[in-house]
């Protein structure tokens, strides 16, 4: 079917970064300034992808392949192919329609995106806050109480922090 | 295409006002937030102000609360920064930008900007 198809359609011989021109008895015509096409036997060429304003270009468009944008300092990517920018906070805030705001008592972020996330209650494993939490930081559990008590032969190692979370994207 | 074309920028003094618009086409302007953004030279992209897709929703970074106002004309597809009292630390290239359809919970994110319009405030 293939071969039939290649003889029957000389379109399909035009190979990524051209297009089968109509206008000119389907002749492979390249694709003109500031578009692209990546695959073969295309009748058109696709528009650019252009990176302004929020977006600055990570990789310039080819006739064979789109722009690449990502997001300008100050803002991080969200979406497929960075589809949309999203501005950072700073650590212990997280982002509102209202900018970026504290976390509140309780809560805390560790990355500049994201959510505020309730520091890790230690009593649920029956373990001892060793280190309080911040805006910043999650707690650190520490020893049950039972293994500090008096006579207790030995110390548990702190449990590790856990793993950051992201926001809903 | 979806457009957003910002005008308005200039030189002004300090204290001065200066009100930017931004043309919008290509998509349903009443349906998404706005938002205007920032970037003073030799620095990021700062947030400044964003507002609802009806007007009823408006918010500021700290720094130009009080001294300017975002508004929107849907009618008309055009966003608006109402600059008083500028300073010299609002020199910067102005953008306009699209936001969301639904803020409710989901991100702050935008989508498509313009090319930016410049502001300089100096005496």
């Known amino acids: 079917f293939e071969r039939t198809r290649s003889l029957q359609d000389p379109c399909s011989n035009c190979p990524a970064g051209t297009f089968c021109d109509n206008n000119r008895n389907q002749i492979c015509s390249p694709c003109p300034p500031n578009s692209f096409s990546s695959a073969g036997g295309q009748r058109t060429c696709d528009i650019c992808r252009q990176c302004k304003g929020v977006f600055r270009t990570r990789k310039e468009c080819s006739s064979t392949s789109n722009a690449e944008c990502d997001c300008t300092p100050g803002f991080h990517c969200l979406g497929a192919g960075c589809s949309m920018c999203e501005q950072d906070c700073k650590q212990g805030q997280e982002l509102t329609k209202k900018g970026c705001k504290d976390c509140c008592f309780g809560t805390f972020n560790d990355q500049k995106r994201g959510i505020c996330r309730p520091w890790t209650n230690c009593s649920l494993d029956g373990k001892s806050v060793l280190v309080n939490g911040t805006k910043e930081r999650d707690v650190v559990c520490g020893p049950s109480p039972a293994d500090l008590s008096p006579g207790a032969s030995s110390v548990t190692p702190p449990a590790p922090a856990r793993e950051p979370g992201h926001s809903p994207q | 295409e979806v457009q957003l074309v910002e005008s308005g920028g200039g030189l002004v003094q300090p204290g001065g006002s200066l009100r930017l618009s931004c043309a919008a086409s290509?998509?349903?302007?009443?349906k998404y937030w706005m938002i205007w953004v920032r970037q003073a030279p030799e620095k990021g992209l700062e947030w400044?102000?964003?507002?609802?897709?009806?007007?009823?929703?408006?918010y500021y970074v700290d720094s130009v609360e009080g001294r300017f106002t975002i508004s929107r004309d849907n009618v008309n597809n055009s966003l608006y920064l109402q600059m008083n009292s500028l300073r010299a630390e609002d020199t910067a290239v102005y953008y306009c930008?699209?936001?969301?359809?639904?803020?409710?919970?989901?991100?702050?994110?935008?989508?498509?900007s313009g090319q930016g319009t410049t502001v300089t405030v100096s005496s």
């Open positions: 930008a699209r936001g969301g359809d639904d803020y409710s919970n989901s991100h702050y994110g935008m989508d498509v």
């Open positions: 290509g998509f349903t302007f009443s």
């Open positions: 400044v102000a964003n507002i609802n897709q009806d007007g009823s929703e408006k």
